[in-house]
Interface confidence: low
């Protein structure tokens, strides 16, 4: 394979184009670019990119920081998928976006020690081990270095999820939920992404073990309520975004968990608010409360009478319980 | 719970080869790295190799390469190692080892290989 | 390779005796990767601390591992009888793994 140069960031090498079927045993050269890859020994960077890669190349480089495998058939990630002989003490950065995994096994990102941010996004993960980000030793749970955890997008097609659709849901929740709790590996987490997952709540238990989070993305999932989510613990939330969602309402509890968090900014455009007298604490809320990014916005959808009225301007007269809500909206 | 058996003890003859198993049950096979650890009577411990059944991949101690095949057959969650050109310094007890970065959580109970003429 | 250097080889230790013992590394060993096993004759090798100081499971609270760099230890606050066996270091940090020559403590 060609040499990588190391006079200009942006030059990359590409190597033979062929793809090497055998493991190698030993460790890369440091020149070394694999099969259908392109590297950039300068910008630490390697990108095999919509290749249709079927498994991670086995000749990584040592010095890789930022990785990028992005658009290929990967299918499943096995444990160990980035286990090297010295290990890949540099990796920062792991791209795996749109690579139709469906399968990430315990273990599948150890010894990657420098590990800090790694996105899954747009992959149909209908298998997502418990043990996926905390190591293949069920009764280890050493801490994990990632930072951020980008899962945007990583729900199955329906006809790929157990049990029909709403069971689907549940248990493709809890499973996602199952993976970021397990054990005490992801406590220095700060950023998570779970957009366009379809949720419809959040488990109780998502976010107990995930102490450091500063930044949470929720939007375009389905979520009706926050009733079940717990915000409490969550003290270094800056950003949790909720827009284009299903929600109805805030409760009294999410209102003070949320008003209760010091640095706390919430985005919670696109919802369709349904108001009514169980809106009366919220506007209230929202009228005093400095955490709402855009509040102004916020609008009502529901009931006819009051759709596009601004719930900043909402008094206690305009809300009332009389309406019959449509099947769809109403929770258990 | 989590059991690695190996096989049984072997008298082989110097120049030859043997191919001894460790079959795994109680997890997950795909999911765990296999070591191969050599330790002579009386005598510490030497890492020989280590194969992830799920992608196949195998690193070797160099010492021991060209001489130890690791393989692994994932229909009976069965780990095996060849080693070949045996000679008297190859008399050790082989054990095989489940984990991984954070240890050997398990191991089998070894396999006493034995070159003699 | 990582050459790890245990001492001291044979240690002897009475009952209720508190017991130190090293192992040293050639080059340094990120310390989630240096862990100690307990081997006992004829039987099979036991994790026995993980990552420096983790405790694997079933390993009573009077042992502790320490250190970091180059210069880790495993100590026995209060020697029993059942503490008497050979105890290896291991590094998982660079190929080849290596373990410790280990040391052999015994109830003096």
């Known amino acids: 394979s060609s040499s990588s140069p190391t006079s200009s960031a942006s030059s990359f090498s590409s190597s033979a184009p062929f793809l090497a079927s055998a493991v190698s045993a030993q460790p890369p050269l440091p020149d070394q670019c694999p099969a259908l890859c392109e590297c950039s020994e300068a910008a630490r960077t390697v990108k095999c990119v919509n290749r249709n890669l079927t498994e991670v190349p086995t000749d990584l480089p040592a010095y890789v920081r930022n990785l990028f495998l992005t658009g290929n058939q990967l299918a499943v990630l096995p444990a160990g998928a980035f286990a090297r002989r010295p290990p890949l003490a540099e990796l920062a950065a792991l791209n795996l976006s749109g690579s139709r995994l469906d399968e990430v096994r315990a273990g599948a990102f150890e010894h990657l020690p420098s590990l800090r941010q790694l996105d899954l996004s747009h992959n149909p993960l209908a298998d997502l081990s418990p043990f996926a980000f905390s190591g293949s030793n069920a009764s280890v749970s050493a801490p994990s270095p990632l930072e951020e955890l980008i899962l945007n997008h990583i729900v199955p097609p329906e006809d790929q999820r157990q049990n029909g659709s709403f069971e689907g849901m549940v248990a493709f929740e809890g499973m996602v939920a199952a993976a970021l709790r397990s054990g005490l590996a992801l406590r220095g987490l700060t950023r998570l992404e779970l957009a366009s997952n379809h949720f419809l709540f959040l488990p109780r238990d998502l976010l107990a073990q995930l102490p450091s989070l500063r930044y949470l993305d929720l939007r375009n999932n389905s979520l009706v309520s926050l009733t079940y989510a717990s915000f409490r613990n969550l003290t270094h939330l800056e950003s949790l975004h909720l827009e284009d969602n299903a929600l109805k309402v805030l409760h009294n509890g999410t209102l003070a968990e949320l008003q209760g968090l010091p640095h706390i900014r919430v985005f919670l455009d696109n919802n369709p608010w349904v108001c009514d007298c169980h809106m009366a604490d919220m506007v209230t809320w929202l009228k005093e409360t400095e955490v709402v990014q855009g509040k102004d916005r916020l609008t009502c959808a529901y009931p006819e009478k009051m759709r596009n009225r601004v719930l900043l301007e909402l008094n206690s007269a305009d809300l009332d319980c009389d309406p019959i809500l449509p099947p769809s909206l109403q929770t258990s | 719970q989590v059991q690695l058996q190996q096989s049984r003890p072997e008298l082989v003859k110097p120049g030859a080869s043997v191919k001894m198993s460790c079959k795994a049950s109680g997890y997950t096979f795909t999911d765990y790295v296999i070591s191969w650890v050599k330790q002579r009577t009386g005598q510490g411990l030497e890492w020989i190799g280590e194969i992830y059944p799920g992608s196949n991949s195998i690193y070797y101690n160099e010492k021991f390469k060209g001489r130890a095949t690791l393989t692994a057959d994932k229909s009976s969650s069965t780990a095996y190692m060849q080693l070949s050109s045996l000679t008297s310094e190859d008399s050790a007890v082989y054990f095989c080892a489940m984990g991984g970065n954070y240890g050997f959580d398990y191991w089998g109970q070894g396999t006493t290989l034995t070159v003699s003429s | 390779q990582i050459v790890l250097t245990q001492s001291p080889a044979i240690m002897s230790a009475s009952l209720g005796e508190r017991v130190t013992l090293t192992c040293t590394a050639s080059s340094s060993v990120n310390s989630n990767y240096l862990h100690w096993y307990q081997q006992k004759p004829g039987s099979s090798p036991k994790l026995w601390i993980y990552?420096?100081?983790n405790l694997a499971s079933g390993v009573p609270a009077r042992f502790s591992g320490s250190g970091s760099g180059t210069s880790y230890s495993l100590t026995i606050s209060s020697m029993e009888a059942e503490d008497a066996a050979t105890y290896y270091c291991?590094?998982?940090?660079?190929?080849?793994?290596?373990f410790g020559a280990g040391t052999k403590l015994e109830l003096k």
């Open positions: 990552s420096t100081s």
């Open positions: 291991h590094q998982y940090h660079r190929s080849p793994l290596t």
